[in-house]
Amino acid sequence: DVERTTCPPEKEVHEIDESLIFYKKRELEACVDAALLAAQMDRVDAIPFTYEQLDVLKHKLDELYPQGYPESVIRHLGHLFLKMSPEDIRKWNVTSLETLKALLKVSKGHEMSAQVATLIDRVVVGRGQLDKDTVDTLTAFCPGCLCSLSPERLSSVPPSVIGAVRPQDLDTCGPRQLDVLYPKARLAFQNMSGSEYFVKIRPFLGGAPTEDVKALSQQNVSMDLATFMKLRREAVLPLTVAEVQKLLGPHVEGLKVEEQHSPVRDWILKQRQDDLDTLGLGLQGGIPNGYLILDLSVREALS
């Protein structure tokens, strides 16, 4: 922590300007009034402060705003944002997308994924929902950031906004997030024709249940293996060999290349070997002919 000293009269600060770069840490602490700093935050980013000096300025703002900075200050943080921790950001209330854009630009190229995730979370809370303007801002300035939101936050996305989401925006989404987004996407694209629907729904299919995957297999969609591999394991396992063949179309030969990877490996283990043989791909590991499969979990549930 910066030690307290009194400010020499000749060092008194009346405005935030370039002369401050020559101040030592303790002089900044003693001579810069926190309220003045807050009022003139828009000047700070133009001044080449050292990281040590920025620490002092942050300390002053923290003292002035122990409950969290107001948006008028947050909007002009500039490189001072790089000093913020997720705990600091959690105290903020942010509603302006201009503020979000400004801070996303600053964070680019820095290891700040936790801070950015918290910032986006605060914006969604501040605005009440994940509206189209917010999604547009995220896709433009922070591809992939949508997936930093919790499933709970993502549940506030109205289906009408889903069309603004691009495949690359979902690249880092986990299964729980796709579980939330998929039903919204299904609703958003429900009036589209078969092929157009598949193109749109494809990035969301990691959240699709078995019955929807089975339905797709009846529509000649020719799903590529990359999409198939992103399907939930639980959605893939009940599919029959015939359904998978119809679902993948000409891409079915890719099963051979991916046979060691889940969910393909797990699916193979659940199929009868003679059914797998009909694909002509040399897939091995299916249930041998003549074997009976007893689902012991059912028996355990009954006992």
């Epitope: 293996l225 591999m229 891409h251 060691q260 990877h261």
Partner: antibody, heavy 119, light 108 residues
């Protein structure tokens, strides 16, 4: 432009471990597996294994089982290959190469990382 | 594992000549699962041909591939100065994936 950029050359002692990174850009990271292939000085190419960045699932060439670990960081579009218990015969150039899921050919390669194992 | 044997190990030819490179597999390879790569000294390999006969993006038409079962061929119809390099065949029909030992095409 599609690019795979690998980390710099490494010099290691026998018994140590090395971790090589491969940062991808210019394409949908999770639509392609990342494979690792090595090439000893004056020798041919040897496939080590692959990772599916979407699921984190890995397949390793049995020759390297127990010594190689492949991981991914989706948020950074980066994959890593760690080789442990290094010996002099592990001296090689290590390449990452992307492979469209469902195909087996490598259409884009990293620039290679030279790993030298010497006491 | 499937062993791929390439022959000849070295091919000495002049620019303008036809080059025929062979790749023989120890057991049958599904033809969809064989590719060819070119590598120049100090550079990474580059995909030339995939699925036995499909030309990769940006590869000139003088390169062609053929074959089935255990025998595969890469042909360069008329050698250009930039074609002198090492060529590798590669199979992913059977695990683990393997490469041939390479054929070096050098200037005569």
């Amino acid at each position: 432009e599609v690019q795979l950029v690998q980390s710099g050359a490494e010099v290691k002692k026998p018994g140590a471990s090395v971790k090589v990174s491969c940062k991808a850009s210019g394409y949908t990271f999770t639509d392609y597996n990342m494979d690792w292939v090595r090439q000893a000085p004056g020798q041919g190419l040897e496939w080590m294994g692959d990772i599916n960045p979407s699921t984190g699932g890995t397949i390793y060439n049995q020759k390297f089982s127990g010594r190689v670990t492949m991981t991914e960081d989706k948020s950074a579009s980066t994959v890593y290959m760690e080789l442990s218990s290094l010996r002099s015969e592990d001296t090689a150039v290590y390449y990452c190469a992307r492979r469209r899921i469902g195909t087996g050919y490598f259409d884009v390669w990293g620039q290679g990382t030279t790993v030298t194992v010497s006491s | 594992e499937i062993v791929l044997t390439q022959s000849p190990a070295t091919l000495s030819l002049s620019p303008g000549e036809r080059a025929t490179l062979s790749c023989s597999a120890s057991s049958s390879v599904i033809s969809s699962y064989l590719s060819w790569y070119q590598q120049k000294p100090g550079s990474s390999p580059r995909l030339l041909i995939y699925r036995t006969s499909n030309l990769a993006s940006g590869i000139p038409a003088r390169f062609s591939g053929s074959g089935s079962g255990t025998d595969y061929t890469l042909t360069i119809s008329s050698l250009e100065p930039e074609d002198f390099a090492v060529y590798y065949c590669h199979q992913w029909s059977s695990f683990p994936y393997t490469f041939g030992g390479g054929t070096k095409v050098e200037i005569k």
